[in-house]
Amino acid sequence: QGGAAEGVQIQIIYFNLETVQVTWNASKYSRTNLTFHYRFNGDEAYDQCTNYLLQEGHTSGCLLDAEQRDDILYFSIRNGTHPVFTASRWMVYYLKPSSPKHVRFSWHQDAVTVTCSDLSYGDLLYEVQYRSPFDTEWQSKQENTCNVTIEGLDAEKCYSFWVRVKAMEDVYGPDTYPSDWSEVTCWQRGEIRDACAETPTPPKPKLSK
């Protein structure tokens, strides 16, 4: 996502429409304290970053408070007074939604409905991944709201679940980030478990009458 002006690579992450993190990787300036200057409005004067990220004792990024800003971030990374990278971006194209909160499971026979608190903004996908020890890989289902029903589960099997939120690429573009996964929770016969056994337990033999 960062063009390489004078060998500077940048990364922007807009955490849950609250905080913007801009980091840079500038091999040419690896031992230099580059400064970060920004504004949210093309008409304003630039402010300098007050919350730098450091790597090996040198500036490598900036954290900005930008709660629910529907703005463009205009920024300049400078070596002294010399700009080494200047750009402007809609921050929302680099959205990383927050991890799902208040995840709940509602079981009904061979199906489970996973719900969580919807985020306050839209054009998101709520993805539930699940697997049993019998599965070689995670299965996935996603919906536009955090209300995802998965059917056809085996009530006798133990299943692990986790949930995340993704910005719709169609709307926000290709440079967003999925949220972190929620904690893994394990369920068997509609009851929560500490864990699912890594090696599947063989099915109990059916007793003939």
Partner: antibody
Framework: QIQLGQSGPELKKPGETVKISCKAS????????MSWVKQAPGKGLQWMGW????????RYADDFKGRFAFSLETSASTAYLQIYNLKNEDTATYFC??????????????????WGQGTLVTVSA | DIVMTQSHKFMSTSVGDRVSITCKAS??????VAWYQQKPGQSPKLLIY???TRHTGVPDRFTGSGSGTDFTLTLNNVQSEDLADYFC????????FGSGTKLELK
């Protein structure tokens, strides 16, 4: 289906004021922002700015600050463009076009999928 | 403002030909580029967004490509109904349009 219907052509004298309407239907009006685009005769497209239909807050492109005003009549799902103190160079077709972003979140002016049919404003003494 | 330059004001083609319309941004815009088709007396119609995603209902003979500063709209097997003006637009920051390229018959 989603439609944006604009008011009819206007013939005005320099110094007068014009108000163009854009009535939206087929979706929840306050969910998506509305942009305005100018096209002078035989020329290209110029983004004039947009209005957040949820908050009513307008944003104007640099070339359209001063004599131009965006407004809303939310109950009628209608956006307005008003141009004051008209000049000859304001002669153009003006389009309203719906934003692709949900306005309760962000105002990123993205791709424009839905357009009004355009309103021709002619300014002539 | 970011300037979008369409260097060819006119491009001549024949039905069945392949034609490429180019657009250059004055600074890196990532893939935040759309392409529109406009016919005389009509509103612009979205063809491509995010540089290469075809909008719903747009024939697959229209293809967008590019990232950063250089973008191309390619029309394969040009049809007579494709003769129109084509505009690129960036939306990495406040939107700006290219000046347009008119596709006409040879």
């Amino acid at each position: 289906q989603i439609q944006l219907g604009q008011s009819g052509p206007e013939l005005k004298k320099p110094g007068e004021t014009v108000k163009i309407s854009c009535k939206a239907s087929g979706y929840t009006f306050t969910t998506y922002g509305m942009s305005w685009v100018k096209q002078a005769p035989g020329k290209g497209l110029q983004w004039m700015g947009w209005i957040n239909t949820y908050s009513g807050v307008p944003r104007y492109a640099d070339d359209f600050k001063g004599r131009f005003a965006f407004s809303l009549e939310t109950s009628a799902s209608t956006a307005y463009l008003q141009i004051y103190n008209l000049k000859n160079e304001d002669t153009a077709t003006y389009f309203c076009t719906r934003e692709g972003f949900i306005t309760t979140v962000v105002g990123a002016a993205g791709r424009f999928v839905y357009w009004g049919q355009g309103t021709l404003v002619t300014v002539s003494a | 403002d970011i300037v979008m330059t369409q260097s060819h004001k006119f491009m001549s083609t024949s039905v069945g030909d392949r034609v490429s319309i180019t657009c250059k941004a004055s600074q890196d815009v990532g893939t935040a580029v759309a392409w529109y088709q406009q016919k005389p007396g009509q509103s612009p119609k979205l063809l491509i967004y995010w540089a290469s995603t075809r909008h719903t209902g747009v024939p697959d003979r229209f293809t967008g490509s590019g990232s950063g500063t250089d973008f191309t709209l390619t029309l394969n097997n040009v049809q007579s109904e494709d003769l129109a003006d084509y505009f690129c637009q960036q939306y990495s920051t406040y939107p700006t349009f290219g000046s347009g390229t008119k596709l006409e018959l040879k």
